[in-house]
């Protein structure tokens, strides 16, 4: 049986049940290399409380559809002698990066996971030449996720004092030059995640090979190497390599750009101070507020919720967008779609799409940017579920009693972007974490 998602095969992936202090190791094409789970375990559960291991999915007992992967076991899941067996179920959804498997829940018999990934898309528009896992769990099982930093087009310019060269990088995947045709990056070789531009020439100085690593708390490392044997003439016989160290700052701050800290014989060391290197609970909330010691800030967008069936309306040329954030009030146009953002075609108001659902909400405050994300909307032709990204700005003189109104700024690949100036986005900072 062919592997259903070959681009996910090269790695053993991790997911965590934080509530029960359990780490899952997942290998969807072969078996995880953990002796205690046996030679054919595809999903191995490590219970950190009891320091025990249990296989909850066998690679031999795999069944797959386009969007669901199930691994059965021969282990009875209750003591009543019925024929139910422990199994793992992974639901796949189209995403714009390789993504991460997320633990959802576990019943007595089934361990459920969800995975938004390019591997599950109907079209190849989001697929990279080369991409590696871009998240890691620290020793306290807290997730550090750099997926939001991955550029689908273009690259980051590294801050460097050399006026003759420019070093461009992407995070965890190669630089897509085709989507960004007008830039210096056009000459970058395919597959490169670190591209050195000198005049009109561009050189591959590193490709992603291994996933993100945690070196110690709040320091993550990504290494790129040049795969081809051919040496570059300006590297004094050495093979180029790039090491990017992502550092979680000791207190809340605005974002910085990646900085070159050392360069010798085409070995580039880059340091990037970014809150995306901090654990995810520091940055994100499933509600409309971020507060408490853990987050160092107080943010509460719940006053933006509209009651009584009214919605915010944002004009998008061909479409009108109806938004109702931070609540569970149905938008009338988007009847029974559980939409937080609803897209209605002006020329045909029967054409209605959910552009993100209120159950699928994430509030994120990172590197000074406050963003409310709604995902899980109606599918586009690529298989990607529509999503909306609302970028908030603090404005103490916003109209509409300080609430302000959302403004549609554009759409890329079924992701709808809005900006919203409001006094409720004014962040109150606490002392550091």
């Amino acid at each position: 049986q062919a592997a259903p998602f070959p681009e996910l095969c090269s790695y053993t992936w991790e997911a965590v049940d934080t509530k029960n202090n359990v780490l899952y190791k997942i290998n969807i094409c072969g078996s995880v290399d953990i002796v205690q789970c046996g030679p054919s375990s595809a999903v191995c559960m490590h219970d950190l409380k009891t320091r025990t291991y249990h296989s909850v999915g066998d690679s031999v007992l795999r069944s797959a559809t386009r969007s669901l992967l199930e691994f059965n076991t021969t282990v009875s899941c209750d003591q009543q002698g019925t024929n139910h067996r422990v199994q793992s179920s992974i639901a796949f959804l189209c995403g714009k990066t390789l993504g991460t498997p997320e633990f959802v829940t576990a019943t007595e018999c089934v361990h459920y996971f969800e995975w938004r990934t390019t591997a599950a898309c109907k079209k190849d528009i989001f697929k990279a030449n080369k991409e590696v896992p871009c998240y890691v769990f620290d020793e306290e099982l807290r997730k550090h996720d750099l997926n939001p930093l991955i550029k689908l087009s273009g690259a980051y310019l590294v801050d460097d004092s050399d006026p003759d060269t420019s070093l461009f990088i992407n995070v965890c995947r190669d630089i897509d030059t085709l989507r960004d045709p007008g830039s210096q990056l056009r000459a970058c070789p395919p597959g490169t995640a670190a591209c050195l531009v000198r005049g009109h020439q561009a050189f591959d100085v590193g490709q992603p090979r291994d996933g993100l690593k945690v070196v110690r708390k709040d320091r993550l490392v990504l290494s790129y190497v040049r795969e081809e044997a051919g040496k570059l003439d300006f590297c004094d016989g050495h093979s180029p390599a790039v090491t990017i160290t992502f550092v979680c700052p000791s207190e809340r701050r605005e974002g910085t750009i990646p900085k070159l800290t050392a360069k010798s014989n085409c070995r580039y060391e880059i340091e990037w101070i970014t809150e995306y290197a901090c654990h995810r609970d520091y940055l994100e909330s499933k509600t409309c507020s971020l507060s408490g010691e853990q987050q160092d800030v107080s943010i509460d967008l719940t006053p933006l919720a509209q009651s009584g069936g009214s919605s915010y309306i944002s004009d998008g040329k061909e479409y009108l967008f109806y938004l109702n954030v931070c609540g569970e009030t149905e938008i009338q146009f988007c009847n029974k779609k559980q939409a937080a953002v609803c897209q209605v075609k002006k020329s045909d108001t029967s054409q209605v799409k959910a552009a993100g659902r209120y159950h699928n909400q994430t509030l994120r405050y990172s590197d000074g940017d406050l963003t409310l994300i709604y995902f899980g909307g109606d599918e586009c032709s690529s298989g990607f579920q529509r999503m909306s990204v609302i970028n908030f700005e603090c404005n103490k003189t916003a109209g509409n009693d300080g609430k302000g109104t959302p403004v549609f700024t554009g759409e890329v690949d079924c992701t709808y972007e809005f900006t919203w100036d409001t006094e409720y986005a004014c962040v109150h900072h606490h002392h550091h974490h």
């Epitope: 934080t18 029960n20 202090n21 409380k49 899941c77 209750d78 576990a106 019943t107 007595e108 018999c109």
Partner: nanobody, 116 residues
Framework: QVQLQESGGGLVQPGGSLRLSCAAS????????MDWYRQAPGKQREWVAT???????TYADSVKGRFTISRDNTKNTVYLRMNSLKPEDTAVYYC??????????WGQGTQVTVSS
């Protein structure tokens, strides 16, 4: 105040059965993962069974097929049903509650003796 109280231990013959109870107070019981451990005389405490907050159960190999862990959220109680008991099951049995927001909470223990 957060407390766990075990009961149901006692003297039983080999091959017999017992049901241990662990009553919790002061916690949102359904949010907690519950574990049973045991400690035989002169030995280290060992894990016996787990009932996670979501409902999955796991057992130590030595008790698999003989012991069953269950819970009743309305009574804030977790149970350990022990069948086909052996002399090597003799120990003090402890229950433990844990959640991401609480430190682990242990009960005082209940003695189980399997002897003819």
């Amino acid at each position: 105040q957060v407390q766990l109280q075990e009961s149901g231990g006692g003297l039983v013959q080999p091959g017999g059965s017992l049901r241990l109870s662990c009553a919790a107070s002061g916690i949102i019981f359904s949010d907690n993962r519950m574990d049973w451990y045991r400690q035989a005389p002169g030995k280290q405490r060992e894990w016996v069974a787990t009932l996670a907050s979501y409902g999955w159960k796991t057992y130590a190999d030595s008790v698999k097929g003989r012991f069953t862990i269950s819970r009743d959220n309305t009574k804030n109680t977790v149970y350990l049903r022990m069948n086909s008991l052996k002399p090597e099951d003799t120990a003090v049995y402890y229950c433990k509650a844990s959640s991401p927001v609480l430190n682990d909470i242990w009960g005082q223990g209940t003695q189980v003796t399997v002897s003819s």
